[in-house]
């Protein structure tokens, strides 16, 4: 009954710090509200990055601040990080939790490695 | 640093209702899934009930479920559980927990100890 | 439910001694929904491992934890004065949330 979580080893984020990932999961159950999760670990601290709660066949619903977005299609949810620096390279895991009806269940990917290269500037042109 | 602090516990009759409280600081506490978890005197630990981060789910154990209700008050960062009808066997310590943002109870409170007994 | 399964329910070693304790549950766990706590007499229990075998933060690299499936172990390599203690695994993956009985590691 365990529910298994499955996302990209690796992602590269483009020249804009955008990057995307489909998380998916395999439900135990006939979920009708689930929350998904993007967590970010650096050196075994986890710190949110954001978050949505939707229900099945409706949109994902980020806050108006928050740096993703996303759609969902049945199991899958198709994320977008925006806003990438160099400095936010890092393992990113999503994390999906089947919020209703009973019973509640969550699983964890083992995580997406973005790698993010800051743009060169661009040469002073004469 | 994260803190976590019981109150409310005490000495009541079979029948009767206790509300217990926790006080919850040094993160953001409407970020956070939290848990009620209680344990008998020299017993191991028994999971209660769960309340989302917005105060919208509730999950319950069977041992409770119509006897207890969990809420949140996420302006006043506390988290409370009402207990009515109470046995003998609800008499424990009553913890309360952070569902860590991996899913285990990261921080527990101290533990407040209710009694019910004629 | 899942029925966590802890055994023994009693080590007794001593000081610099090797701890097995082993958890076993009545249906799969995903590996990274199982944890281990330690509690001490008068204190609330302490997260030690999660997700099968990470450590929580500030958690001795002495203890450590594998398994996966319905098995489970959390080791002590080396037991300490201040390891004495009652051990719990618990599943977070689904409700109800559930707690295996205890392993006692005492003094011999």
């Known amino acids: 009954k365990a529910m298994h979580v499955a996302q990209p080893a690796v992602v590269l984020a483009n020249s804009r710090g955008t990057a995307s990932f489909v998380c998916e999961y395999a439900s135990p159950g006939k979920a009708t509200e689930v929350r998904v999760t993007v967590l970010r670990q650096a050196d075994s601290q986890v710190t949110e990055v954001c978050a949505a709660t939707y229900m099945m066949g409706n949109e994902l619903t980020f806050l108006d601040d928050s740096i993703c977005t996303g759609t969902s299609s049945g199991n899958q949810v198709n994320l977008t990080i925006q806003g990438l620096r160099a400095m936010d390279t890092g393992l990113y895991i999503c994390k999906v939790e089947l919020m209703y009806p009973p019973p509640y269940y969550m699983g964890i990917g083992n995580g997406t490695q973005i790698y993010v290269i800051d743009p060169e500037p661009c040469p002073d042109s004469d | 640093q994260v803190q976590l602090v019981e109150s409310g516990g005490g000495v009541v009759q079979p029948g009767r209702s206790l509300r217990l409280s926790c006080a919850a600081s040094g993160f953001t506490f409407s970020h956070y899934t939290m848990h009620w978890v209680r344990q008998a005197p020299g017993k191991g630990l028994e999971w209660v009930t769960f309340?989302?981060?917005?105060?919208?789910?509730?999950y319950y154990a069977d041992s409770v479920k119509g006897r207890f209700t969990i809420s949140r008050d996420n302006s006043k960062n506390t988290l409370y559980l009402q207990m009515n009808s109470l046995r003998a066997e609800d008499t424990a310590i009553y913890y309360c927990?952070?569902?860590?943002?991996?899913?285990?109870?990261?921080?527990w409170g101290q533990g407040t100890l209710v009694t019910v007994s004629s | 439910e899942i029925v966590l399964t802890q055994s023994p329910g009693t080590l007794s070693l001593s000081p610099g001694e090797r701890a097995t304790l082993s958890c076993r549950a009545s249906?799969?766990?995903?590996?990274?929904?199982l944890a281990w706590y330690q509690q001490k007499p008068g204190q609330a229990p302490r997260l030690l491992i999660y997700g099968a075998f990470s450590r929580a933060t500030g958690i001795p690299d002495r203890f450590s934890g594998s398994g996966s499936g319905t098995d489970f172990t959390l080791t002590i390599s080396r037991l300490e004065p201040e390891d004495f203690a009652v051990y719990y695994c618990?599943?977070?993956?689904?409700?109800?949330?559930?707690f295996g009985q205890g392993t006692k590691v005492e003094i011999k």
């Open positions: 309340i989302s981060y917005d105060g919208h789910n509730k």
């Open positions: 249906q799969e766990v995903g590996e990274s929904e």
């Open positions: 618990q599943q977070y993956g689904s409700s109800p949330w559930t």
């Open positions: 927990a952070r569902h860590g943002w991996l899913g285990p109870f990261d921080y």
